[in-house]
Amino acid sequence: FERTRSLQDPCSNCPAGTFCDNNRNQICSPCPPNSFSSAGGQRTCDICRQCKGVFRTRKECSSTSNAECDCTPGFHCLGAGCSMCEQDCKQGQELTKKGCKDCCFGTFNDQKRGICRPWTNCSLDGKSVLVNGTKERDVVCGPSPADLSPGASSVTPPAPAREPGHSPQ
């Protein structure tokens, strides 16, 4: 089949990095500068992606593969193949159309991207707040208030009760 195809279509012999040049009797010609073909048998070469402005070059274009971009520092990639660059914010902030804004009270963001999320509600799990939340950090939940009887440690749970007269097992 391959042999038949190549007899019928001389372009199928053109390897990646070349194109089948109709203007030159279907000779395989190298891709021109700033273009590439990643598969054989192509009749045109594709224009290389340009990484400029908010984008910077992660991998140069070659005759057989497209350039790959990432984002200039201060921005991060979004989408497949880094199709977009989005602004970084500081921890404790979220990105809005007005730029980076501080998280509202009761919310936090511990990353340079993403949105502010509500602090964990410890009481929903029957626990108490061990460490208060901030704009950058979630609250830390501790044991339930019932466990915090006078004299008990707030971190170590009380030892299991033993019947009098019994030695430890």
């Epitope: 402005g53 979004l78 989408g79 199709s83």
Partner: nanobody
């Protein structure tokens, strides 16, 4: 081909003014949010301002509020940045950039930007 080309940069004294322009081609400008971002020497990229499709919403980074004005002329496929009361810290390469599909709804990503125009503020 989708393209953005900035112009209007130059050397200006502190307190002076400049007007940057950005010519868009290969797409319909009026369909997109547009942005200006800048990169000072040796620093990361900083968002400066944005403007919605019809120009009714405009937002600025705190450091340029009251000094810079972003505007657009969709009929001319152009974006502008009027820069007044320039300071040494405004020295940077300025890029115009298009907000990607869904900008302001799902994300604030920029999908196309130009080569930039250099603004130098010095006495």
């Amino acid at each position: 081909e989708v393209q953005l080309v900035e112009s209007g940069g130059g050397l200006v004294q502190p307190g002076g003014s400049l007007r940057l322009s950005c010519a868009a081609s290969g797409f319909t400008l009026s369909n997109y949010w547009m942005n200006w971002v800048r990169q000072a020497p040796g620093k990361g990229l900083e968002w400066v301002a944005n403007i919605n499709q019809d120009g009714s919403e405009r937002y600025y980074v705190d450091s340029v509020k009251g000094r810079f004005t972003i505007s657009r002329d969709n009929a001319k496929n152009s974006l502008y940045l009027q820069m007044n009361s320039l300071r040494a810290e405004d020295t940077a390469v300025y890029f115009c950039a298009r907000g990607g599909e869904g900008y302001g709804v799902d994300h604030y990503g920029l999908d196309v930007s130009g080569q930039g125009t250099t603004v130098t503020v010095s006495s």
